[in-house]
């Protein structure tokens, strides 16, 4: 029993005086607990505890169940304890079934014994099969056996506590271990468009796809230099064990002009964190901006071919584009087209093919173009000498 | 700091018993799991026994179960291993080992790589 120097408080004594016990099922657990300033015994075993305000601990008939740590606290919170067995050949483990592990971090497979006099106490694959090869355990009769630096491959790894008994194995009831594993790559996000360009009234849009090893990842959608709070809708989906994929949709039900910038979608773990931003750019109305990529005057010799070209911007898309030259409407000889196949492409370009040109044939040829909300046109000068 | 000197081993004639024993000095011996591994000519080092640090609960690789028995006393921390009915495939020079945790591994074989110390060793020979 503990020393200490007189004066000092010092914790309470055990009757028996021994760390361990060892007593048969049906036997009597009698425990006295000696201190002047006794306050109560404590009982422990895996999930479980119970107190007791009497100083001798009495157990009539023991069962496995009493098999546990007992601890005897004083008034001063000093405390002693004694590790009781109760050796019963029908009920060789106590187990609480529950088994999580961090990846790389030790997990404890909770099937304390009831009698520590016992040989092979280890783990056993289920139906025989091996357990994995890089596998290993410490073992400790009063709290179970620890596996060792887990790892992702053991998730849904189903084992036994076993001991050797007369050369026979004896199983506890089965566990199955969790993987939970670590982060060990920053998310991977993507986005469902780069840019957005809108007008005002029209609804905003845009999905961030968030992968990673399991759904504790964090995310949200952000706007640049802003603290506003954004509403999100989630879905997300487990693809197989380690596969996991959230996606995180932010809506603007009616953009407006001053809700044009820049959106980060973040997300982080505990290894790091990534993002990627898409841009909204909402117009008050719709626009079309002609850019000629050649001069508007132009000068050609009879007999010569000429390639009038314009690149232009609408915004919505372009419903209605024609050349024309003196009231008319040319049908053929002129080709219009997306500048990219870009689904936010709005760029175009078109080209008027004019080819052996008379002397008679000069004049002004006007590129219109219009859409839903505007009509443009730009006029090319053409001189045949 | 922990020594470990093995003693007890020598020349036997099958079936026959020997008693291995190993003292340990310089820690605390009661807080080591303690084992003996052997290594016969030609072969790997392997497991044969261990006993945890409460001197109750023991190990056996299957090579041996049912005829070694290890066991330990702690006041003379020293750790013993009985052999009996030996065969010539015992013959060896057996190693006392000791770890503050020792790791197991499929079939309750201590892995060798979580010893903390090991004995110079002493030899066993069964002849038949």
């Known amino acids: 029993q503990p020393s200490v120097s007189p004066g000092e408080p010092s914790p309470p004594s055990i009757h028996p005086g021994k760390s361990d016990l060892i007593v048969r099922v049906g036997d009597e657990i009698r425990l006295l607990c000696t201190d002047p300033g006794f306050v109560k015994w404590t009982f422990e075993i895996l999930d479980e505890t119970n107190e007791n305000k009497q100083n001798e601990w009495i157990t009539e008939k023991a069962e496995a169940t009493n098999t546990g740590k007992y601890t005897c606290t004083n008034k001063h919170g000093l405390s002693n304890s004694i590790y009781v067995f109760v050796r019963d050949p029908a009920k060789l483990f106590l187990v609480d079934r529950s088994l999580y592990g961090k990846e790389d971090n030790d997990t404890l497979v909770r099937c304390p014994l009831t009698d520590p006099e016992v040989t092979n106490y280890s783990l056993k694959g289920c139906q025989g099969k091996p357990l994995p090869k890089d596998l290993r355990f410490i073992p400790d009769p009063k709290a179970g056996i620890m596996i060792k630096s887990v790892k992702r491959a053991y998730h849904r790894l189903c084992l036994h506590c076993s001991v050797d008994q007369e050369g026979k194995s004896v199983l506890s009831e089965k566990f199955i271990l969790k993987v939970r594993p670590a982060f060990k790559a920053v998310p991977v996000v993507s986005v469902s468009k780069a840019s957005y360009l809108l007008r005002e009234g029209e609804e905003f849009t845009v999905t961030c796809t968030i992968k990673d090893v399991s759904s504790s990842v964090y995310s949200t959608w952000k706007r640049e230099n802003s603290q506003t709070k954004l509403q999100e809708k989630y879905n997300s989906w487990h693809h197989g064990d380690f596969n996991y994929e959230r996606q995180a949709t932010l809506t603007i039900s009616s953009a407006r002009v001053n809700d044009s910038g820049v959106f980060m979608c973040y997300a982080n773990n505990t290894f790091g964190s990534a993002n990627v931003t898409t841009t909204l750019e909402v117009v008050d109305k719709g626009f079309i901006n002609i850019f000629p990529m050649i001069n508007t005057t132009v000068f050609v010799n009879d007999g010569e071919n000429v390639d009038l070209i314009v690149e232009y911007e609408a915004f919505p898309k372009p419903e209605h584009q024609q050349w024309i030259y003196m009231n008319r409407t040319f049908t053929d000889k002129w080709e219009d087209y997306p500048k990219s196949e870009n689904e936010s492409n709005i760029r175009y370009v078109s080209e008027l093919h004019l080819t052996r040109l008379k002397g008679t044939e000069g004049g002004t040829y006007t590129f219109l173009v219009s859409n839903s909300d505007v009509n443009a046109a730009i006029a090319f000068n053409v001189y045949v000498n | 700091q922990v020594q470990l000197v093995e003693s007890g081993g020598g020349l036997v004639q099958a079936g026959g018993s020997l008693r291995l024993s190993c003292v340990a000095s310089g820690r605390t011996f009661s807080s080591y799991a303690m084992g003996w591994f052997r290594q016969g000519p030609g072969k790997e080092r392997e497991f044969a026994a261990a006993?945890?640090?409460?001197?109750?609960?023991?190990y056996y690789a299957d090579s041996v179960k049912g005829r070694f028995t290890i066991s330990r006393d702690n006041a003379k921390d020293t750790v013993y291993l009985q052999m009996n009915s030996l065969k010539p495939e015992d013959t060896a020079n057996y190693y006392c080992a000791a770890a503050f945790t020792p790791e197991f591994r499929d079939g309750g074989i201590w892995d060798d790589a979580s010893v903390d110390y090991w004995g110079q060793g002493t030899q066993v020979t069964v002849s038949s």
């Open positions: 006993i945890l640090s409460n001197g109750l609960t023991t």
